[in-house]
């Protein structure tokens, strides 16, 4: 907290300019009018203020806008944004995508990792949250912007938050944006993707839907197996176990096409391991891959889950 002291004679700032870099902290506090600062915020980042001086300027803005900064100030914060806490940002009402982009850009510039971080820092997450809430939904332009800065952004949202993503926004999603999503999140995103891409033809559809298939039900996988899609093993390994189990050997063979040979290398891992346990060994042998662990000939398969449901 900076003490209130009178501004020395002749030092009252008439504009935000380079002469202020020679002001001590108490002089900045006493001699810079907060309203002037607010109207000339765009100048602050073009002047080499020290971090300590920036703290004083922030303090002045906080006093002028105790209820939160207006967007006209927010859009010009630049490096001063890095001084903001989540509590500060919760008071803001950010509606312009340009403002959001400008602040994300500055923040990205100050993140030490050369790779884009998977999840935003707390103050950035708060900024994004305020912005999305203000818009009411995650529209395509917003999603485009956020995933460009944070490839893992979508996967940082809860299934409830993801439910506000309109199917039209799914076109902005790239495969890498879903890398860290868990099955619950893909369960929400998959039906939206299916809707978004429904008018595409077979091969184009598969390319687009592929990264969302971790949320696909059995019937959709069965349908895909009829379309010569040649799913790769990496995609197959991300499918829901409960969706894979009911697939027949013939269906899996059609689904994977030439990639079916990869099952051998994955036979100890889910969902392949659990699927093998559900297949007749005779059927598995038709693949010629040496997969072991299927149901021996002459054994009866009882579906206990069905039995429990009936009792």
């Amino acid at each position: 907290e900076v003490e209130k002291t009178a501004c020395p004679s002749g030092k009252k700032a008439r504009e935000i300019d380079e002469s202020l870099i020679f002001y001590k902290k108490w002089e900045l506090e006493a001699c810079v009018d907060a309203a002037l600062l607010a109207t000339q915020m765009d100048r602050v980042n073009a002047i080499p203020f020290t971090y300590e001086q920036l703290d004083v300027l922030k303090h002045k803005l906080d006093e002028l806008y105790p209820q939160g900064y207006p967007e006209s100030v927010i859009q010009h914060l630049g490096y001063l944004f890095l001084k903001m806490s989540p509590e500060d940002i919760r008071k803001w009402n950010v509606t312009s995508l340009e403002t959001l982009k400008a602040l994300l850009e500055v923040n990205k510039g100050h993140e030490m990792s050369p790779q884009a971080p998977r999840r935003p820092l707390p103050q950035v997450a708060t900024l994004i949250d305020r912005f999305v809430k203000g818009r009411g939904q995650l529209d395509k332009d917003t999603l485009d912007t956020l995933t460009a800065f944070y490839p893992g952004y979508l996967c940082s949202l809860s299934p409830e938050e993801l439910s506000s993503v309109p199917p039209s926004s799914i076109w902005a999603v790239r495969p890498q944006d879903l890398d860290t999503c868990d099955p619950r999140q893909l369960d929400v995103l998959y039906p939206k993707a299916r809707l978004a891409f429904q008018n595409m033809n077979g091969s184009e559809y598969f390319v687009k839907i592929q990264s969302f298939l971790g949320g696909a039900p059995t019937e959709d996988l069965k349908a895909l197996s009829q379309q010569n899609v040649s799913m790769d093993l990496a995609t197959f390994m991300k499918l829901r176990t409960d969706a894979v189990l009911p697939l027949t050997v013939a269906e899996v063979q059609k689904l994977l096409g030439p990639h079916v040979e990869g099952l051998k290398a994955e036979e100890r891992h889910r969902p392949v391991r659990d699927w093998i346990l559900r297949q007749r060994q005779d059927d598995l042998d038709t693949l010629g891959l040496g997969l072991q662990g299927g149901i021996p000939n002459g054994y009866l398969v009882l579906d206990l889950s069905m039995q429990e449901a009936l009792s």
Epitope: Y51, H76, G78, E105
Partner: nanobody
Framework: EVQLVESGGGVVQPGRSLRLSCAAS????????MHWVRQAPGKGLEWVSG????????FYAGSVKGRFTISRDDSTNTLYLQMNSLRAEDTAVYYC?????????WGQGTLVTVSS
């Protein structure tokens, strides 16, 4: 990856002019105020000039005010420094910078030598 590449330096006689350029890439140039900073042989770093994001306001160290002019072209992501009436004390390596407080946002520099 953020890259700032300065050019235009060289040996020049006192009273003459030079124009430095800085080609920026790997970030949204138009989102940043930009700066020129210099380091004279055996001396510390000195901020020279800054320009706002919009280019609407420019700022200068007292030692160069009235002689140097900073400008920017967002269409080519380029920052400029027009240096007129050069003096021996302007001899330095000149760096362009996104943030003069952080060395990791500077280019590799271009040497300006003012000598008769």
């Amino acid at each position: 990856e953020v890259q700032l590449v300065e050019s235009g330096g060289g040996v020049v006689q006192p009273g003459r002019s030079l124009r430095l350029s800085c080609a920026a890439s790997g970030f949204t140039f138009s989102s940043y105020a930009m700066h020129w900073v210099r380091q004279a042989p055996g001396k510390g770093l000195e901020w020279v000039s800054g320009i706002t994001r919009s280019g609407g306001a420019t700022f200068y160290a007292g030692s160069v005010k009235g002689r140097f002019t900073i400008s920017r072209d967002d269409s080519t992501n380029t920052l400029y420094l027009q240096m007129n009436s050069l003096r021996a004390e302007d001899t330095a390596v000149y760096y362009c910078s996104r943030d003069p407080r952080r060395v990791d946002y500077w280019g590799q520099g271009t040497l300006v030598t003012v000598s008769s």
